[in-house]
Amino acid sequence: MMTGTIETTGNISAKKGGSVILQCHLSSTMAQVTQVNWEQHDHSLLAIRNAELGWHIYPAFKDRVAPGPGLGLTLQSLTMNDTGEYFCTYHTYPDGTYRGRIFLEVLESSVAEHSARFQIP
C-alpha cells in the first residue's frame, strides 16, 4: 500500500537568464528511494539520481543542469522555452512509483520572483 505523499515547489516563476531550484520531497513513507527521474514538459529526461550509481545528467542539459540540493535539481541559464511542466518520479521499494508536478514560468520581467513555497500538487 502506498502511503507516501510528494510535496513539490508547486507553481514557480523565475527570471530569464537566471536559475531555479526544482524540488520534490517524499514524506509519510518508510520506503527506500532507489531512483529519482526528472523530466521536462515534453517528457524528455533531464537527469536521473540513482541510489547505486549516482547522478546522470542527460547530454542535452549538461551545461545548465546541476544536481541538488538533495534529490532536487537546479536549472540554470533559463530561457523562455523552459516554461512548462516538470515532473519528479520517485521509484521506491516496496511502495512503487510516486510522481510530483512543478510548473515553471520563465518571465522576461526583471521583477520576476521565484516563489519557493512547498505545496502538495
Epitope: 536521473i48 540513482n50 547505486e52 550509481l53 549516482g54 544536481p67
Partner: antibody, heavy 119, light 107 residues
Framework: QVQLVESGGGLVQPGRSLRLSCAAS????????MHWVRQAPGKGLEWVSG????????GYADSVKGRFTISRDNAKNSLYLQMNSLRAEDTALYYC????????????WGQGTMVTVSS | DIQLTQSPSSVSASVGDRVTITCRAS??????LAWYQQKPGKAPKLLIY???SLQSGVPSRFSGSGSGTDFTLTISSLQPEDFATYYC?????????FGGGTKVEIK
C-alpha cells in the same frame, strides 16, 4: 566467501571484438549494482562501466562509450563486458567489482583479466 | 565529467610518519568519495567510503575527511605494509572517475 572471477581476456587485433565475463559467488548478485574498472600496464585505475541491479541505468566512461556494452544475467550470477572496435589504448587488466550497498565504494574486486590489443 | 586531481603524485616517507594525500574534484561531489590502496600485482583495496567512513577491517590509522571539492586521506603513523599507491574515486556523477594516484615510497 564473496568472490568475483573474470575471464575472457586475451590477445586481439585492433578493430576486433572481445567479451569479458565475471562470475560472482558468495553474495546475492541480483541485489547489487556491478562495475568494470581497468588498469593499463604501469598506469592508474580507470572506471569503465557500471550497471544497476536490474539493468535500468547504465554508465560508461567517455573513452569506451559507443564501443563497449555492459550487461548482466542475474539468473547466472554473471556480469559481462562486450568490447567492440578495440584499440591499442584498451590494453589493460580488466577488473570486475562489487560496491558497498548504496554507499558506492567498491569493496570486492576480482583478480582481473588481461586484454592486449595489438597487431 | 568530474576530474579528480591527487597531490602529491608521489611521497617519500618513513615508518611512523604522518602522511597526508589530497584529492580535489573539478565540481562539488558532496561526500561521494572513496579511497583505495593498491599494491603491485594486486587488486585495489577499499579503505574509505563516503569521504570519511572507514571500511570494515581497515586499521584506524587511516582516516578520510572533506566534502564538496576538497578531500584528504591521512595515515597517522605509517607502517611498513602501507607503502603502496593510493587512489581517490568519485561516485556522485556518472561517469565515475578515479584520481591519478599517489605513490607512497620508503624514504
Amino acid at each position: 566467501q564473496v568472490q568475483l572471477v573474470e575471464s575472457g581476456g586475451g590477445l586481439v587485433q585492433p578493430g576486433r571484438s572481445l567479451r569479458l565475463s565475471c562470475a560472482a559467488s558468495g553474495f546475492t548478485f541480483r541485489d547489487y549494482a556491478m562495475h568494470w574498472v581497468r588498469q593499463a600496464p604501469g598506469k592508474g585505475l580507470e572506471w569503465v562501466s557500471g550497471i544497476t541491479w536490474n539493468s535500468g541505468l547504465i554508465g560508461y566512461a567517455d573513452s569506451v562509450k559507443g564501443r563497449f556494452t555492459i550487461s548482466r544475467d542475474n539468473a547466472k550470477n554473471s556480469l559481462y563486458l562486450q568490447m567492440n572496435s578495440l584499440r591499442a589504448e584498451d590494453t589493460a587488466l580488466y577488473y570486475c567489482a562489487k560496491p558497498v550497498p548504496r554507499l558506492r565504494g567498491l569493496d570486492v574486486w576480482g583478480q582481473g583479466t588481461m586484454v592486449t590489443v595489438s597487431s | 565529467d568530474i576530474q579528480l586531481t591527487q597531490s602529491p603524485s608521489s611521497v617519500s616517507a618513513s615508518v611512523g610518519d604522518r602522511v597526508t594525500i589530497t584529492c580535489r574534484a573539478s565540481q562539488g561531489i558532496s561526500s561521494w568519495l572513496a579511497w583505495y590502496q593498491q599494491k603491485p600485482g594486486k587488486a585495489p583495496k577499499l579503505l574509505i567510503y563516503g569521504a570519511s567512513s572507514l571500511q570494515s577491517g581497515v586499521p584506524s590509522r587511516f582516516s578520510g575527511s572533506g566534502s564538496g571539492t576538497d578531500f584528504t586521506l591521512t595515515i597517522s603513523s605509517l607502517q611498513p605494509e602501507d607503502f603502496a599507491t593510493y587512489y581517490c574515486q568519485q561516485a556522485f556523477y556518472l561517469p565515475w572517475t578515479f584520481g591519478g594516484g599517489t605513490k607512497v615510497e620508503i624514504k
